[in-house]
C-alpha cells in the first residue's frame, strides 16, 4: 500500500493543501485513496511512513511575522483531528520572494478509515512547479 | 533491495552529483547498482522510496539570483529523463557562504533498468563533509 | 520493527537530544527500545531506514558563527561512535530568533544492540512544540 500525489493550486481559501493524481504519481491499489483532493485515506490498520514536501516562496516584509509552517495532520474515525508533524521556516529577505523547501516524515499507526492531510499557514505561497510539493505514504 | 551512497567531489562540470560506495554506505545486493558514480540503477520493477539529501554553502551576492535547486530525476529505458522531485533554497546572506540542507523523498514506480540521479544548480556549492550529502533508495 | 519518538526539553547540558514515548509516538514491539531517553536501540541485525527531524530557533547575532548542525549518530557494540548523517542551516537574521527545520533520513545496516541518537550544536535552540522535533526508524 503506497501513494504519492502531486500538489495542485487551488482557488479555495482553506489552509489545507490540495493534491492530484497527475504527473508521476503513485496509487498502488484501492486500499489507499485520495479523497476530495485533500486527504489520503487508508482502509487497513497498520504502521505507515507518511511524508510531505512543501516548497514555498515568501518575503519577510510581505508576510506576517510568524514563520511559514507546514503541518501533517491526522483524522481518525470517531476522533478529533490531531497534529503528527510540523516544520517551520522563517521567511526570506529575498525579493520578490525567496524559495525554501520543507520535508516532513515519520512512522505512525493508522486505523481503518484514517485520513492524513497537510495544512500550511499560507497556501498562496506554495510552489506548484514540477516536483516541488508532494505528499505520500507507504505501509510498512 | 536498498542502497545508500555518499557524495563525492568531482572535477567534472556536470550538474549531476557524483556518488561513491564509501564510508557507511549500503548496497544490499546486485539488484541495485551505482553506475558511473552518478546513478542508482534497479533491476527489478516495483515501488521504491527514493531519497536524497544535499547540503550546500552559498552566498547571495556571489551566486546567481536563482535559488539553489536540487532535483531527483528518473531515466527509464527507452524514455526521456523526467523530474520526480525538486527542492529549492534561496542563497544565504552569510559570508563567505551560509550552509543549508535540502531533503527530498518519495515513493515511485521504477521499471527494470531504470536509473535515478540527482541534479543541482551549482555542484561547486555542495558540501561533501561526513554525512552532509547522500542518496539512496529502498524497495517496498 | 518501527519507532517514532517525540522530543523532550532537557536541563542537561549535553548536545545529545532527549526523547520520550509521549503524544502520538510509535514503539512497535520490544525489538526496538528507547534507552535513557536518548537513543533508539535495536535487537535485530538488518537494514533500517532511520530519520530525524529537528526544528530550531536561532539568531545570527546571538549565536556562534558556525551553523546549526544536526547529526544522526551510530554506536555499535564494541565500536566507536560514528556519524551517519548531518544537516546544517545557517542562523537566521530574524529577531528574536528565526525558526528553521532540518530533516535527515537514510538506509543503514544495524547490528544487534546498535544504538542511534541525534546530536545538535545547541540543544537550547531546539523547538519542542507539538510535532516540531522527532526521531524514528523502521526495519526494511
Amino acid at each position: 500500500i503506497a501513494a504519492h500525489v502531486i500538489s495542485e493550486a487551488s482557488s479555495k481559501t482553506t489552509s489545507v493543501l490540495q493534491w492530484a493524481e497527475k504527473g508521476y504519481y503513485t496509487m498502488s491499489n484501492n486500499l489507499v485513496t485520495l479523497e476530495n483532493g485533500k486527504q489520503l485515506t487508508v482502509k487497513r490498520q497498520g504502521l505507515y511512513y507518511i511524508y510531505a514536501q512543501v516548497t514555498f516562496c515568501s518575503n519577510r516584509e510581505a508576510s506576517s511575522q510568524a514563520p511559514f509552517i507546514a503541518s501533517l495532520c491526522l483524522k481518525s474515525p470517531g476522533r478529533f483531528e490531531r497534529i503528527l508533524l510540523r516544520a517551520a521556516n522563517t521567511h526570506s529577505s529575498a525579493k520578490p520572494c525567496g524559495q525554501q523547501s520543507i520535508h516532513l516524515g515519520g512512522v505512525f499507526e493508522l486505523q481503518p478509515g484514517a485520513s492524513v492531510f497537510v495544512n500550511v499557514t499560507d497556501p498562496s505561497q506554495v510552489s506548484h512547479g514540477t516536483g516541488f510539493t508532494s505528499f505520500g505514504l507507504l505501509k510498512l | 533491495i536498498a542502497a545508500h551512497v555518499i557524495s563525492e567531489a568531482s572535477s567534472k562540470t556536470t550538474s549531476v552529483l557524483q556518488w561513491a560506495e564509501k564510508g557507511y554506505y549500503t548496497m544490499s545486493n546486485n539488484l541495485v547498482t551505482l553506475e558511473n558514480g552518478k546513478q542508482l540503477t534497479v533491476k527489478r520493477q516495483g515501488l521504491y522510496y527514493i531519497y536524497a539529501q544535499v547540503t550546500f554553502c552559498s552566498n547571495r551576492e556571489a551566486s546567481s539570483q536563482a535559488p539553489f535547486i536540487a532535483s531527483l530525476c528518473l531515466k527509464s529505458p527507452g524514455r526521456f529523463e523526467r523530474i520526480l522531485l525538486r527542492a529549492a533554497n534561496t542563497h544565504s546572506s552569510a559570508k563567505p557562504c551560509g550552509q543549508q540542507s535540502i531533503h527530498l523523498g518519495g515513493v515511485f514506480e521504477l521499471q527494470p533498468g531504470a536509473s535515478v540521479f540527482v541534479n543541482v544548480t551549482d555542484p561547486s556549492q555542495v558540501s561533501h563533509g561526513t554525512g552532509f550529502t547522500s542518496f539512496g533508495l529502498l524497495k517496498l | 520493527i518501527a519507532a517514532h519518538v517525540i522530543s523532550e526539553a532537557s536541563s542537561k547540558t549535553t548536545s545529545v537530544l532527549q526523547w520520550a514515548e509521549k503524544g502520538y509516538y510509535t514503539m512497535s514491539n520490544n525489538l526496538v527500545t528507547l534507552e535513557n531517553g536518548k537513543q533508539l536501540t535495536v535487537k535485530r541485525q538488518g537494514l533500517y531506514y532511520i530519520y530525524a527531524q529537528v526544528t530550531f530557533c536561532s539568531n545570527r547575532e546571538a549565536s556562534s558563527q558556525a551553523p546549526f548542525i544536526a547529526s544522526l549518530c551510530l554506536k555499535s557494540p564494541g565500536r566507536f561512535e560514528r556519524i551517519l548523517l548531518r544537516a546544517a542551516n545557517t542562523h537566521s537574521s530574524a529577531k528574536p530568533c528565526g525558526q528553521q527545520s532540518i530533516h535527515l533520513g537514510g538506509v543503514f545496516e544495524l547490528q544487534p544492540g546498535a544504538s542511534v541518537f541525534v546530536n545538535v550544536t545547541d540543544p537550547s535552540q531546539v523547538s519542542h512544540g507539538t510535532g516540531f522535533t522527532s526521531f524514528g526508524l523502521l526495519k526494511l
Epitope: 478529533f80 497534529i83 | - | 503524544g23 509516538y25 512544540g129
Partner: nanobody, 116 residues
Framework: EVQLLESGGGLVQPGGSLRLSCAAS????????MMWVRQAPGKGLEWVST????????YYADSVKGRFTIFRDNSKNTLYLQMNSLRAEDTAVYYC?????????WGQGTLVTVSS
C-alpha cells in the same frame, strides 16, 4: 486524572462576543495540543479549533475562521476561545478537549446561546 473545566458561556446577541476559558489539571498542560469542539442541539460533535503545545500554530474549522481565536496560557494551565461576530448557528455546548494516544478527553462543557 485528566480534568478539564470550561467556563464563560452564556446568552449573547448575534454579532456579539464571548470568551470561553478551560482550566486544565492532571497532566502536563504545556506538553499537549488542545482543542475546542462543540455540539449544537440535536447534532453530533463538531471540531472548532486546535492549538499546538507551544501556541505557535492554530487551526480552525472553516465555519469559524476569521471570527474565533484560540489561545493558551501555559503558565496558568488555561485554554481560551475568543468568539466574535457570533451567529445563531454558533449556538452549542462548547467543550475543551485533549487528544490522548488512544482516545480523547473533554470536559463537561459550557453552553453558548446566540439569540436576539
Amino acid at each position: 486524572e485528566v480534568q478539564l473545566l470550561e467556563s464563560g458561556g452564556g446568552l449573547v446577541q448575534p454579532g456579539g462576543s464571548l470568551r470561553l476559558s478551560c482550566a486544565a489539571s492532571g497532566f502536563t498542560f504545556s506538553d499537549y495540543e488542545m482543542m475546542w469542539v462543540r455540539q449544537a442541539p440535536g447534532k453530533g460533535l463538531e471540531w472548532v479549533s486546535t492549538i499546538t503545545s507551544d501556541g505557535i500554530s492554530t487551526y480552525y474549522a472553516d465555519s469559524v475562521k476569521g471570527r474565533f481565536t484560540i489561545f493558551r496560557d501555559n503558565s496558568k494551565n488555561t485554554l481560551y476561545l475568543q468568539m466574535n461576530s457570533l451567529r445563531a448557528e454558533d449556538t452549542a455546548v462548547y467543550y475543551c478537549a485533549k487528544s490522548g494516544r488512544f482516545f480523547d478527553y473533554w470536559g463537561q462543557g459550557t453552553l453558548v446561546t446566540v439569540s436576539s
